[in-house]
């Protein structure tokens, strides 16, 4: 019928609609390295999965160029605040690309969660959520960083996580 | 042309792209039951809608298996707090499935918002946002819980809400 | 083969899947007008882009009717709080439509961030994130407002932003 090539493409695309790139990675005991690197994530167990995206050393890696909604939440908490802690916690999503030598800030939040918890060494909790649409080329990577990561609280993968899907 | 079945499927899928499952439910006076159950939601009035998802007793119910971006925001506020600065609020999205007897934690935040009140004025406001991609089978449900729900403020459906869409 | 019209439509739709409406606008020095109007945004430089959506005086404008996940984050911060500031900051997404004379609240958060300043160091940071699915007709607009906008902190477009994509 003369539509052969396009037809196959359409059929493939219909199937791959169900394979629209998506991922949800969860916090784990190994997430906090203390090395100054990005947070590391669980990719398979529990709620974690990768579909059409790769993972490498804390990074989600695009296999298909396009616009992605990327997101991350981190659970913060403490008893008072560590001595010498600056009053700011920075939680950010950063892009690594062969086109630049340094990571590129994508989405960033700054918070002062310790607030009034300093006086009586009180327990406090706070949460930071980031989400937004960014363009990724094939091979480009996105990582999560938290400064000061001593205040990130991990438990069961539901409180700190990192994900993306193509829009 | 031999492509009949697939063709019909493609045409249907093209139409159903506009029916990609999505929902946005809004807070209402009846949301807070005080019964220990999940929050209840408005499904039709104002900004609320259901498209390809069902609703049952506070839960969004999947009609189609797949990955969904689920989200919820709750507006927190009060005059003082029941446990003072030690008050912790837990806001979470939970899955109900026939495969497990108990609800499964999906996305959870803990906050200590009561420190936000200034010295004399005991009034404070805070907000908690959760969002992430999870897999739902047909018939599986997602609910929102807040502990302590006494601190949730409802007004007009714009401050506390719950939604999802397939990715 | 008798499927001509529909076939062309399908081909076009396949291509336009890559053109699913999406946008991400970023904060800039010109975002805060002090005029009582909505925040203004960068639409082209850096991480900002428009794909199948228009921009006009702070507003994202729908070119295609449907359900959109809209989102905004604002970075808040200060040294103490401005004299006379109410203890509440309101961050909201609002719809403008020819069908109503006034803006319609879509998604709103209220926060009391000033309580986060400790007694000695009065510097504080906080962040507000909003996201949810709303229906937009062709020509309807969405804007971001923050009251009191004096507390919005802009830097490089990563801390305060506004976006949308069709779901």
């Amino acid at each position: 019928d003369g539509h052969g090539g396009s037809w196959e493409q359409l059929i493939q695309e219909r199937r791959s609609h169900q394979n629209n790139p998506a991922a949800h990675l969860t916090g784990a005991n190994s997430s906090l390295t203390g090395s100054g690197g990005p947070l590391l994530w669980e990719t398979q167990l529990g709620l974690a999965f990768l579909r059409g995206l790769d993972y490498h050393d804390g990074a989600l890696v695009a296999n298909k160029a396009g616009y992605y909604y990327i997101y991350s939440k981190v659970q913060l908490g403490g008893v008072g605040c560590p001595l010498g802690l600056a009053s700011t916690i920075t939680h950010g999503l950063y892009k690594r690309t062969p086109r630049y030598p340094e990571e590129l800030e994508l989405l960033v939040s700054q918070q002062s969660p310790c607030g009034r918890a300093t006086s009586n060494s009180r327990v406090w909790w706070d949460s930071s959520f980031l989400g937004g649409v960014v363009h990724l080329e094939v091979g480009e990577e996105v990582v999560v960083r938290v400064l000061d990561e001593r205040l990130v609280r991990l438990r069961d993968g539901t409180r700190s996580y990192f994900g993306a899907f193509m829009v | 042309d031999g492509h009949g079945g697939s063709w019909e499927q493609l045409i249907q899928e093209r139409r159903s792209h506009q029916n990609n499952p999505a929902a946005h439910l809004t807070g209402a006076n009846s949301s807070l039951t005080g019964s220990g159950g999940p929050l209840l939601w408005e499904t039709q009035l104002g900004l609320a809608f259901l498209r390809g998802l069902d609703y049952h007793d506070g839960a969004l119910v999947a009609n189609k298996a797949g990955y969904y971006y689920i989200y919820s925001k709750v507006q927190l506020g009060g005059v003082g707090c029941p446990l003072g600065l030690a008050s912790t609020i837990t806001h979470g999205l939970y899955k109900r499935t026939p495969r497990y007897p108990e609800e499964l934690e999906l996305l959870v935040s803990q906050q200590s918002p009561c420190g936000r009140a200034t010295s004399n004025s005991r009034v404070w406001w805070d907000s908690s946002f959760l969002g992430g991609v999870v897999h739902l089978e047909v018939g599986e449900e997602v609910v929102v819980r807040v502990l302590d729900e006494r601190l949730v403020r409802l007004r007009d459906g714009t401050r506390s809400y719950f939604g999802a869409f397939m990715v | 083969d008798g499927h001509g019209g529909s076939w062309e439509q399908l081909i076009q739709e396949r291509r336009s899947h890559q053109n699913n409406p999406a946008a991400h606008l970023t904060g800039a020095n010109s975002s805060l007008t002090g005029s009582g109007g909505p925040l203004l945004w960068e639409t082209q430089l850096g991480l900002a882009f428009l794909r199948g959506l228009d921009y006009h005086d702070g507003a994202l404008v729908a070119n295609k009717a449907g359900y959109y996940y809209i989102y905004s984050k604002v970075q808040l911060g200060g040294v103490g709080c401005p004299l006379g500031l109410a203890s509440t900051i309101t961050h909201g997404l609002y719809k403008r439509t020819p069908r109503y004379p006034e803006e319609l609240e879509l998604l709103v958060s209220q926060q009391s961030p000033c309580g986060r300043a400790t007694s000695n160091s009065r510097v504080w940071w906080d962040s507000s994130f909003l996201g949810g699915v709303v229906h937009l007709e062709v020509g309807e607009e969405v804007v971001v407002r923050v009251l009191d906008e004096r507390l919005v902190r802009l830097r490089d477009g990563t801390r305060s932003y506004f976006g949308a994509f069709m779901v």
Partner: antibody, heavy 119, light 111 residues
């Protein structure tokens, strides 16, 4: 049933201190705020402050700041109010009042403790 | 601090009659559509007793003849049909701001 039982009447000299106790029973002690209120002869009710038994956190009326201290003994479900540098105008009946479920009212009260300050 | 002013200071009412007590705050005691105003009853030699919380909510165990109304700065306690046990002093109290403050009281006496 909820009960708040206060210690007995006290007579004190000016400049002295007094410590009044309030023992709670019939509910989960740490789940409710405890307030202290006094009523002086011929006067109205006056709020002294509150304590959160769960943490020991306190909020005091500025008028009493530096002279009043609230403490809690969770093992015996008892809160204490100590008032120092007593003067004659501190003569009053002192009440403990439990914070209600919605915490901004006092739904149960102790029977009161009369503190008399006299030389 | 927020000053609470009650009127009248004394109200003489016959049993079975309606009693209306007023309380004014020096600034609004409202937050998010709720009024942080409570009413208490106190009899000689007894502790205060909570009647109404959040301006209009009847405390459990309190007879339905007691009702509260108002918002912002002006509030009213109404006793629809006074019973002999209702003769007492009534206090309003705000809880939106520290320090919590009470009105000076309204004494309801037998006419």
């Amino acid at each position: 049933q909820v009960q708040l039982v206060q210690s007995g009447a006290e007579v004190k000299k000016p400049g002295a201190s007094v410590k009044v106790s309030c023992k709670a029973s019939g509910y989960t002690f740490i789940d409710h705020i405890m307030n202290w209120v006094r009523k002086a002869p011929g006067q109205g009710l006056e709020w002294i402050g509150r304590i959160y038994p769960v943490s020991g956190e306190t909020n005091y009326n500025q008028k009493f700041m530096g002279r009043v201290t609230f403490t809690v003994d969770r093992s015996t479900s008892t809160v204490y109010m100590e008032l120092s540098s007593l003067r004659s105008e501190d003569t009053a009946v002192y009440y403990c009042g439990r914070g209600s479920y919605y915490w901004n009212a006092m739904d149960y009260w102790g029977q009161g403790t009369l503190v008399t300050v006299s030389s | 601090e927020i000053v609470m002013t009650q009127s009248p200071a004394t109200l003489s009412v016959s049993p079975g009659e309606r009693a209306t007590l007023s309380c004014k705050a020096s600034q609004s005691v409202d937050f998010d559509g709720e009024s942080y105003m409570n009413w208490y009853q106190q009899k000689p030699g007894q502790a205060p007793r909570l009647l109404i919380y959040s301006a209009s909510n009847l405390e459990s165990g309190i007879p339905a003849r007691f009702s509260g109304s108002g918002s912002g700065t002006e509030f009213t306690l109404t006793i629809s049909s006074l019973q002999s046990e209702d003769f007492a002093v009534y206090y309003c109290q705000q809880s939106i701001e520290d320090p919590w403050t009470f009105g000076q009281g309204t004494k309801v006496e037998i006419k």
